[in-house]
């Protein structure tokens, strides 16, 4: 079976690499525009230049193209803690990232949020914080892990999953209460 190609891919595949088929005349292959530029006018004929113009400030194209407009530069999301790593140029979109000692949590493919790396207080670092993953902590005795923080077993309710980890402490508390009744 031949994979189904979109009209644009079908048209482009007729021309050699780096060229595209003229939208009004399928016997003409025009040279694509370089990155940092966009298509202002198709080439008038074979062997003639495509009219490409540089992207205006606030827009870019990152690869050779025959786009009628440049793409708008992304803005880093301050409300998500993002900072600008590098500014947008005519041939490269803005690069956003996180500050030092922070990691990215991806809510979706194109939305990440910056959070502080856990310090593992009352525990030890099992895996160091990485660009896309928080520190993995192992808690000291008498503490259990809740939302990647080591919390005292005195905060462990019987209904929570911490009961297994905090079982000796819970038994001790129960025993102390029981021994008070004679």
């Amino acid at each position: 079976l031949v994979p189904h190609l979109g009209d644009r891919e079908k048209r482009d595949s007729v021309c050699p690499q780096g060229k595209y088929i003229h939208p009004q005349n399928n016997s003409i292959c025009c040279t694509k525009c370089h990155k940092g530029t966009y298509l202002y006018n198709d080439c008038p004929g074979p062997g003639q230049d495509t009219d490409c113009r540089e992207c205006e400030s606030g827009s870019f194209t990152a690869s050779e193209n025959h786009l009628r407009h440049c793409l708008s530069c992304s803005k880093c999301r301050k409300e998500m803690g993002q900072v600008e790593i590098s500014s947008c140029t005519v041939d490269r979109d803005t690069v956003c990232g996180c500050r030092k000692n922070q990691y990215r949590h991806y809510w979706s493919e194109n939305l990440f949020q910056c959070f502080n790396c856990s310090l593992c207080l009352n525990g030890t670092v099992h895996l160091s914080c990485q660009e896309k993953q928080n520190t993995v902590c192992t808690c000291h005795a008498g503490f259990f892990l809740r939302e990647n923080e080591c919390v005292s077993c005195s905060n462990c309710k019987k209904s929570l999953e911490c009961t297994k980890l905090c079982l000796p402490q819970i038994e001790n508390v129960k025993g102390t209460e029981d021994s008070g009744t004679t």
Epitope: H105, W107, S108, E109, N110, L111
Partner: nanobody
């Protein structure tokens, strides 16, 4: 058409509680992470909390951690924010938001005023 409708705001005394709700329609609610974002008078937007598609993970801004709880009911297409131990600095318009697709979608907001 995506619609987000917040409710539950109002005037509350410091130390009091409120529960905000957000009714969602026009998209598959259970397929999307959801967020609460607020804007205090004369200030910029501040992300408050977010929740994953199935109710996990949940994240909170440091300023509300331990006081606010985000939850969702996918069968009712509703997002919630339980706010306890409210402080004057929590006074803001609270927006329910679907973020991160080709477009962001916001509700019209609900005003929370914390004052004695």
């Amino acid at each position: 058409e995506v619609q987000l409708l917040e409710s539950g705001g109002g005037l509350v005394q410091p130390g009091g509680s409120l529960r905000l709700s957000c009714a969602a329609s026009g998209f598959t609610f259970g397929d999307e992470p959801m967020h609460w974002v607020r804007q205090a008078p004369g200030k910029g937007l501040e992300w408050v909390s977010g929740i994953g598609k199935e109710g996990q993970p949940t994240y909170y801004a440091d300023s509300v951690k331990g006081r606010f709880t985000i939850s969702r009911d996918n069968s009712k297409n509703t997002l919630y924010l339980q706010m306890n131990s409210l402080r004057a600095e929590d006074t803001a318009v609270y927006y329910c938001a679907k973020l991160g697709g080709p477009f962001d979608y916001w509700g019209q907001g609900t005003l929370v005023t914390v004052s004695s």
